[in-house]
Every structure is written in C-alpha cells, then in structure tokens.
C-alpha cells in the first residue's frame, strides 16, 4: 500500500517521490475538474 | 466544442474484463492528468486514480490497484481504463475527467 | 484513508434563503505550506458532478459568488447566500491531501 509522509506533502509509491497535494500553481491539471490554462 | 466522450454501457459477467475509453474532442488530451472515478448504484464518489499522459505515470487508490488499470493513447487523444475480475460490486458509472472536462459517465453493469 | 462525514444528508431548502452544509475530516487538511486541501463538489440531476470551491475558498471559473466556504482544519461549512433553483442535486465534500476520498453526499432540494 501506499505510504504517506504527511509532514513533506510527498507520498512515496512504487519507489518514487510524487507531490500528491499540489499547489495552486500546479498546471498539470491535479485538481479533480478543475479548468487549467487555456484549451490547446 | 471541447468535451471529453466516453465509450457507451456495458454489461459482464463476474470475472470478465471491460476497457472504458474516454476521448478528448477539441482537447489535447495528452496535456493535463486525466482521473477516473466511479459513482455506485444511489452511493457517492470514489477515486480510482490518474494518469499522466505525458510519461504514462499512475497513481491509483489502493482499494483499486490490482482492479484498474490506466493508460492513454496520445496519438488518438483517447484514455483508457480497464477493470479485470469484476464482480457485482463493480456495477457503477465511471467517470474520466481532465482539466474542467468531465466525460458523460459509462455504466458498467456486472451481473451473471 | 482520510474519511470525510457530511451533514446532513438531505437538505430542503427555500429559494432565496440561505442555505448551510457541513462537512468534516477525520484528519487536518491544513498542510504546513498553508494551502488547505478541501474541495467541494455539486452533482445536478442526471449530470456529471462540477467543482464549485477548490483548495477550500476559492471559486472555480464560472462558479456564483452566492457560494462560499469556510472551515478550520477539520471542519468545512459551504454557504449558499440565496438558494436558486438551479442549486438542486448532490454536494460533496472531498479532500486530497492524502490521494482523494470523498464525503457521502448531501442532497439539496427545493421544499
């Protein structure tokens, strides 16, 4: 299962650093439904 | 008109497979993550996971690790989930969404 | 897993006045950067769902200023200034602080 380090925000999963809880700024589109950028 | 369409109904057997497609129209699809979730017969919302399209990265729910996979075929803007070993419980609509777009819903149906 | 508890369950409301739904999470969303990570949803009547209020108080585009939402790191309050008609359907609370899991839902319908 995935594990949590919730003081870093990261998440460690299959060996790798993921920033889960992107910020705002975050143009990759991680927030559920959320309109990013312009449509392309 | 920019929107995201998803393949239609089906209905399986318990322990078969079934692959959802969900294409962007008027969207590059392949720009922003795309997230799969699923709404239970009158129940309320559960994450599955996302892909990145650009590098095919996943994460998923725990719950649905060894359930769904993800995958994206950039060259046709389409992304994929499909489900193995399904059982009644899987019966739901499921949901792809990218950027703002939500697709329509597919309703998968498992039942002998 | 973050569990997250709505209240209540069904709501009739009047139109034009306002209208509250409560939600809770079993565990903070506020990470030490600031940002709190509390999202809320609305699910019209045969629709797919749309994000109204992310990251907990901003208003995604094309989202009325009549919605609003508050809370502390554990408990979250969305406001409706003056119900309209075309607020009817399903809320849902969600977090992502740890993957995504979302509240069971709050039905909202005219009285």
């Known amino acids: 299962d995935a594990e949590f380090r919730h003081d870093s925000g990261y998440e460690v999963h299959h060996q790798k650093l993921v920033f889960f809880a992107e910020d705002v700024g975050s143009n990759k589109g991680a927030i559920i439904g959320l309109m990013v950028g312009g449509v392309v | 008109q920019v929107q995201l369409v998803q393949s239609g109904a089906e209905v399986k057997e318990p322990g078969a497979s079934v692959k959802v497609s969900c294409k962007g129209s008027?969207?590059?699809?392949?720009?922003?993550?795309v997230h799969w979730l699923r709404q239970l017969p009158e129940k309320g919302l559960e994450w599955i996971g996302r892909?990145?399209?650009?590098?095919?990265?996943?994460i998923y729910t725990p719950k649905f690790q060894d359930k769904a996979t993800l995958t994206v075929d950039t060259s046709t803007d389409t992304a994929y989930m499909e489900l193995s070993s399904l059982r009644s419980e899987d019966t739901a609509v499921y949901y792809c969404?990218?950027?703002?777009?939500w697709g329509q819903g597919t309703l998968v149906t498992v039942s002998s | 897993d973050i569990v997250m508890t709505q209240s209540p369950l069904s709501n009739p409301v009047t139109p034009g006045e306002p209208a509250s739904i409560s939600c809770r999470s079993s565990?903070?969303?506020?990470?030490?950067?600031?940002?709190?990570?509390l999202y809320w949803y609305l699910q019209k009547p045969g629709q797919s769902p749309q994000l109204l209020i992310y990251?907990?108080?901003h208003l995604a585009s094309g989202v009325p200023d009549r919605f609003s939402s508050s809370g502390s790191g554990t408990d979250f309050t969305l406001k409706i200034s003056r119900v309209e008609a075309e607020d009817v359907g399903v809320y849902y609370c969600?977090?992502?602080?740890?993957?995504?899991?979302f509240g069971q839902g709050t039905k909202v319908e005219i009285k």
């Open positions: 008027g969207f590059n699809i392949k720009t922003y993550y």
């Open positions: 565990k903070s969303l506020l990470h030490r950067n600031g940002i709190t990570y």
């Open positions: 892909i990145d399209p650009e590098n095919g990265e996943t």
């Open positions: 990251q907990m108080s």
């Open positions: 969600a977090q992502n602080l740890e993957l995504w899991t």
């Open positions: 969404v990218s950027s703002g777009y």
